[in-house]
Interface confidence: low
């Protein structure tokens, strides 16, 4: 594993995989990022999803002092989204197109989370909200919201790993 006993991760490997995640997250729903289809005054309903915030130690100083805080936060987020992408929200109707990148995105989230999971140590994972929309149209709306917040999350994670690879790699 990349973080045996809580040591530094394989920053370069993590950087490469997180960049791939960014690409996949954009291709999974390309219009989410560069165009805002909400109306003025719409509220973002992303309170339930993990965000990387100022106190999470993901700034350059925090990463230098103890990268584990930030890596734990990223790991929690990856597991959270991995569970969501494997849930009925994405597996139910309407079925994804056969060549949809969501499957690859799901696998890559799992791959990066495994890179960050220390051997024999299990970080607490955030509970995923019990979302079981009954209508296909509700699922689609949830997919958009999840992919929008996932794009933001992996963009920050990719910046963290790029910084780590450039400055913290042995």
């Amino acid at each position: 594993r990349a973080v045996p006993g809580g040591s530094s991760p394989a920053w370069t490997q993590c950087q490469q995989l997180s960049q791939k995640l960014c690409t996949l997250a954009w291709s999974a729903h390309p219009l989410v990022g560069h165009m805002d289809l909400r109306e003025e005054g719409d509220e973002e309903t992303t309170n339930d999803v993990p965000h990387i915030q100022c106190g999470d130690g993901c700034d350059p100083q925090g990463l230098r002092d103890n990268s584990q805080f930030c890596l734990q936060r990223i790991h929690q987020g990856l597991i959270f989204y991995e569970k969501l992408l494997g849930s009925d929200i994405f597996t139910g109707e309407p079925s994804l197109l056969p060549d949809s990148p969501v499957g690859q995105l799901h696998a890559s989230l799992l791959g990066l989370s495994q890179l960050l999971q220390p051997e024999g140590h299990h970080w607490e994972t955030q509970q995923i909200p019990s979302l079981s929309p009954s209508q296909p149209w509700q699922r689609l709306l949830l997919r958009f919201k999840i992919l929008r917040s996932l794009q933001a999350f992996v963009a920050v994670a990719a910046r963290v790993f790029a910084h780590g690879a450039a400055t913290l790699s042995p």
């Epitope: 219009l31 289809l37 994804l96």
Partner: nanobody, 116 residues
Framework: EVQLVESGGGLVQPGGSLRLSCEAS?????????MYWVRQAPGKALEWVSA????????YYADSVKGRFTISRDNAKDTLYLQMNSLRSEDTGVYYC????????RGQGTQVTVSS
């Protein structure tokens, strides 16, 4: 069951116009959803053409159709429209209205053929 039904396609000469419609039936809240037009040219992948926000105040276009196509919607009629002007041969394809940009949830489509 929710259905999206497109109409208005046909054969038109280059430079001509068509107006596509898409009626959403059995959908109680059409106005809750941003809507898209996507198209598939013969032998090519599905591509998004245009998008419109829920109330219609925000509209977006692929570069290839900008200035020629206009998307609109009538939430009272649960209907989406695409006005296509100055049509070119490369606009030929099956046009679908969809609830997502990748066309996962879409209608059966309407054929547009631009040819002299």
């Amino acid at each position: 069951e929710v259905q999206l039904v497109e109409s208005g396609g046909g054969l038109v000469q280059p430079g001509g116009s068509l107006r596509l419609s898409c009626e959403a039936s059995a959908l109680t809240s059409f106005s809750n959803y941003a809507m898209y037009w996507v198209r598939q040219a013969p032998g090519k992948a599905l591509e998004w053409v245009s998008a419109i926000s829920r109330a219609g105040s925000n509209t977006y276009y692929a570069d290839s159709v900008k200035g020629r196509f206009t998307i609109s919607r009538d939430n009272a009629k649960d209907t989406l429209y695409l006005q296509m002007n100055s049509l070119r041969s490369e606009d030929t394809g099956v046009y679908y209205c969809a609830v997502d940009s990748s066309g996962t949830w879409r209608g059966q489509g309407t054929q547009v053929t631009v040819s002299s």
